[in-house]
């Protein structure tokens, strides 16, 4: 069964800067990745970035840099101040779509006990939705 993992890290140098990494553990080819915060996209979450493997990347503030790390993983750097700044308990969600086979989504937030700049290796997060 395909799985999605999400890793959130606060940068030690900039406390308002977050790095979100997401990956897809499965055999399907990815047609679109959507990254949102505040909950799953389509369920109250706000889209931060959308990545297409061939057509490019779209991103919205406070997203600073979204990119593909591998064919099945992406990273997104957020930086913000004031109202647009993420906080420690912000939930970030990644949805990997493989049209028309299905889509898989998982969410994560900063580990409560983590020090800035330190993070555990990514582990599969609970799958919230699988079509």
């Amino acid at each position: 069964t395909p799985e999605v993992w999400v890793q959130v890290r606060m940068e030690a140098t900039e406390l308002s800067s977050f790095t979100i990494r997401c990956g897809f553990l499965g055999s399907g080819s990815i047609s679109l990745v959507t990254v949102s915060w505040g909950g799953p996209n389509g369920a109250g979450g706000t889209t931060l970035a959308v990545l297409h493997p061939e057509r490019g990347i779209r991103q919205w503030a406070p997203a600073r840099q979204a990119r593909w790390e591998t064919q099945s993983s992406i990273s997104l750097i957020l930086e913000g101040s004031g109202a647009s700044s993420p906080c420690a308990n912000t939930t970030f969600c990644c949805k990997f779509a493989s049209f028309p086979e299905g889509s898989w989504e998982a969410c994560g937030s900063l580990p409560p006990s983590s020090d800035p700049g330190l993070s555990a290796p990514p582990t599969p997060a609970p799958i919230l939705r699988a079509d």
Epitope: G42, T46, V50, H52, R55
Partner: nanobody, 121 residues
Framework: EVQLVESGGGLVQPGGSLRLSCAAS????????MGWFRQAPGKGLDEGVA????????KYADSVKGRFTISHGNAKYILYLQMNSLRAEDTAVYYC??????????????WGQGTQVTVSS
């Protein structure tokens, strides 16, 4: 949870018409396009039979221009596809999808289970 539900498919003779409908529920949509995509038996997915973006711009695949018409219902999350002068090569599973525009192309982020359209005498 996002749900897109298609209806209106079926068996029709060549030259006939069908109207597909798509209803979205549980949806707080932040994408910028919706459309109809299809997959014929044993073939790959069509890039987009007919799509419409939030600005109302409509795009049709060359193979359906002048025969198919995409439109929204009274609500933003109702989508229709009027298919006229149907041909055997239109036989496929038709998917309603919502997504994001890249380079003028609508890329699906959410979609329904699909509805079968068969054109045969």
């Amino acid at each position: 949870e996002v749900q897109l539900v298609e209806s209106g498919g079926g068996l029709v003779q060549p030259g006939g018409s069908l109207r597909l409908s798509c209803a979205a529920s549980g949806y707080s949509y932040s994408g910028d396009c919706m459309g109809w995509f299809r997959q014929a038996p044993g073939k790959g997915l069509d890039e987009g039979v007919a799509t419409i973006d939030n600005a109302g711009r409509i795009k049709y695949a060359d193979s359906v221009k002048g025969r198919f018409t995409i439109s929204h219902g009274n609500a933003k999350y109702i989508l229709y596809l009027q298919m006229n002068s149907l041909r055997a090569e239109d036989t496929a599973v038709y998917y309603c999808a919502a997504g994001w525009t890249f380079g003028g192309q609508c890329s699906p982020a959410d979609w329904g289970q699909g509805t079968q359209v068969t054109v045969s005498s």
